[in-house]
Interface confidence: low
Amino acid sequence: LPKAPVITTPLETVDALVEEVATFMCAVESYPQPEISWTRNKILIKLFDTRYSIRENGQLLTILSVEDSDDGIYCCTANNGVGGAVESCGALQVKMKPKITRPPINVKIIEGLKAVLPCTTMGNPKPSVSWIKGDSPLRENSRIAVLESGSLRIHNVQKEDAGQYRCVAKNSLGTAYSKVVKLEVEVFARILRAPESHNVTFGSFVTLHCTATGIPVPTITWIENGNAVSSGSIQESVKDRVIDSRLQLFITKPGLYTCIATNKHGEKFSTAKAAATISIAEWSKPQKDNKGYCAQYRGEVCNAVLAKDALVFLNTSYADPEEAQELLVHTAWNELKVVSPVCRPAAEALLCNHIFQECSPGVVPTPIPICREYCLAVKELFCAKEWLVMEEKTHRGLYRSEMHLLSVPECSKLPSMHWDPTACARLPHLDYNKENLKTFPPMTSSKPSVDIPNLPSSSSSSFSVSPTYSMT
């Protein structure tokens, strides 16, 4: 008798590995024999599709080599014209051993920046990703994290982060390892030991010592009064990423010697400088009885700060005063390093006017020091924080050269404009035109007790303080 189709073995969920065989069975009882069709995600599977094998009158569907994209719902439908068609459905879950689709690559990074080593994976179940540094599992911390993507992110990269890394992707089916990659941490050139200043007798031998570090190891060059060192012997040694350079000199004239450490990061260079002065005891320039002369400023560093066509005092204790004083300003500015936007113009004005002092021409050219009030204004009002840092470094002996002592005046030793207004110079860059500015803060103050004035960029402005302003 005719009998409507009945599916005696309903389809079940099938788990299959990629590239393996997966079979769905759809056992049907009916008379006459039914026609059995198969669908995947409601799309008919064609009988001639070579990726599939359909056997046992359509009751067995075999996927010959499972691919990741074969995931889905498979249904068999049986129909023999007696009664209605019947259907049974089951899922294919494609299981996949972990696979690293985007492995990490070698990275060169500058210390302090952020490094990301990629490690993108595939797999079902989703693999967990961990990292190995050297031979040990890598521990996450506030700087080091494995991202959701599997990539390794290192904030504020440190020297000790350098090394060999590999990522490991793991699920219940297996483990995949990436190839080993190298993280190289580069470090800007930094001077560890600055050359020391010397006061020696004519004809002495002096050895200047400069030590620097960085990754890659920097090279050291020596500059004498702004030019390449013309005489003297240089000995160098490198150990544990530290370069040690010794410049031996036969002293016949005073000079400013600068050690410049340079290293390369890709196409860019980083440099660090430190300088030392060599002065000669009892030194005086031939045919000059005085200690200096007046000349118009022709340099660059202080161009925007000094008054146009200003007569400045050039100190003949240097072999080439213009060059030496210019380099002194430049080096001093580098030594001051980071200052706030409020401090910068004031500090520049102070440095330039202190090193290139106003000059009073005459039979004996005389330098005119900065008025104490202006020095205090910079120290207490504009650069309180920076000044404290610098003084602290001086006390702790962190300045190896005496450069900063030459370039930053000691306010208390400067003449006050209240004593003799012509005996000291005003800083053209500090223009106190605030109506409410009555007094400067006391010496003990660590922050301004008055408004911080605007700092005009015009060098023609003048510092107008009435004699009634009290100073501490």
Epitope: I110, A272, K337, V338, S340
Partner: antibody, heavy 129, light 107 residues
Framework: EVQLVESGGGLVQPGGSLRLSCAAS????????IHWVRQAPGKGLEWVAS????????SYADSVKGRFTISADTSKNTAYLQMNSLRAEDTAVYYC??????????????????????WGQGTLVTVSS | DIQMTQSPSSLSASVGDRVTITCRAS??????VAWYQQKPGKAPKLLIY???SLYSGVPSRFSGSRSGTDFTLTISSLQPEDFATYYC?????????FGQGTKVEIK
């Protein structure tokens, strides 16, 4: 005169996108960081994102990570905030602000350390169906 | 994330009063703290940066100080134009956070 001018705000449906612009003038854009800060009606200030114009490095508040993107075009002195998948809780006045950064030992430092000294007038973003 | 807990959330004071607003950081933020003043419908204005540095053009009655992770904004003698909302902000980490604000109202 220093100016920051925001534009691009408006009404958008949940799930939609907007791109805010912040045109800067009167200061060195390259040595600045640009920040986006928002303020929901009647609420306090909430930092959204920052970019260092010089290095291009960015950071985002957790509430917008993955949905918002900050960028800067130094040739145009302009910063942008691309906002995708907007939600009702993103409704706020969006301010752009700048802070001074400085070049020191080969890196740009101080983003935010010197305070956000200049602010725009703000642009209103309303997310509503 | 570093939380900035600002107190009080509001206060009433009279002209001439000394006003103190405090912010406590949930962890060390060095001196990377700024203070802002905001009036209704206006953008915030920077008052103090680096914990204690007075911003250019800000009256000297405003001052900032730091003690460990506690930061204080002080208005030595409240003026009529000082009635506003004040916010602290830290930028020690790359994730900047603001305090919830303190509204200074007329008593």
């Amino acid at each position: 005169e220093v100016q920051l001018v925001e534009s691009g705000g408006g009404l958008v449906q949940p799930g939609g996108s907007l791109r805010l612009s912040c045109a800067a003038s009167g200061f060195t854009f390259y040595s600045s960081s640009i920040h986006w800060v928002r303020q929901a009606p009647g609420k306090g200030l909430e930092w959204v994102a920052s970019i260092s114009s010089s290095s291009g490095s960015t950071s985002y508040a957790d509430s917008v990570k993955g949905r918002f993107t900050i960028s800067a075009d130094t040739s145009k002195n302009t910063a942008y905030l691309q906002m995708n998948s907007l939600r009702a809780e993103d409704t706020a006045v969006y301010y752009c602000a700048r802070s001074y950064t400085m070049f020191y030992y080969g890196g740009w430092y101080g983003s935010g350390y010197f305070g956000m000294d200049y602010w725009g007038q703000g642009t209103l973003v309303t997310v509503s169906s | 994330d570093i939380q900035m807990t600002q107190s009080p959330s509001s206060l009433s004071a009279s002209v001439g009063d000394r006003v103190t607003i405090t912010c406590r950081a949930s962890q060390s933020v060095s001196s990377a703290v700024a203070w802002y003043q905001q009036k209704p419908g206006k953008a915030p204005k920077l008052l103090i940066y680096s914990a204690s540095s007075l911003y250019s053009g800000v009256p000297s009655r405003f001052s900032g100080s730091r003690s460990g992770t506690d930061f204080t904004l002080t208005i030595s003698s409240l003026q009529p134009e000082d009635f506003a909302t004040y916010y602290c902000q830290q930028s020690s980490s790359s994730l900047i956070t603001f305090g919830q604000g303190t509204k200074v109202e007329i008593k």
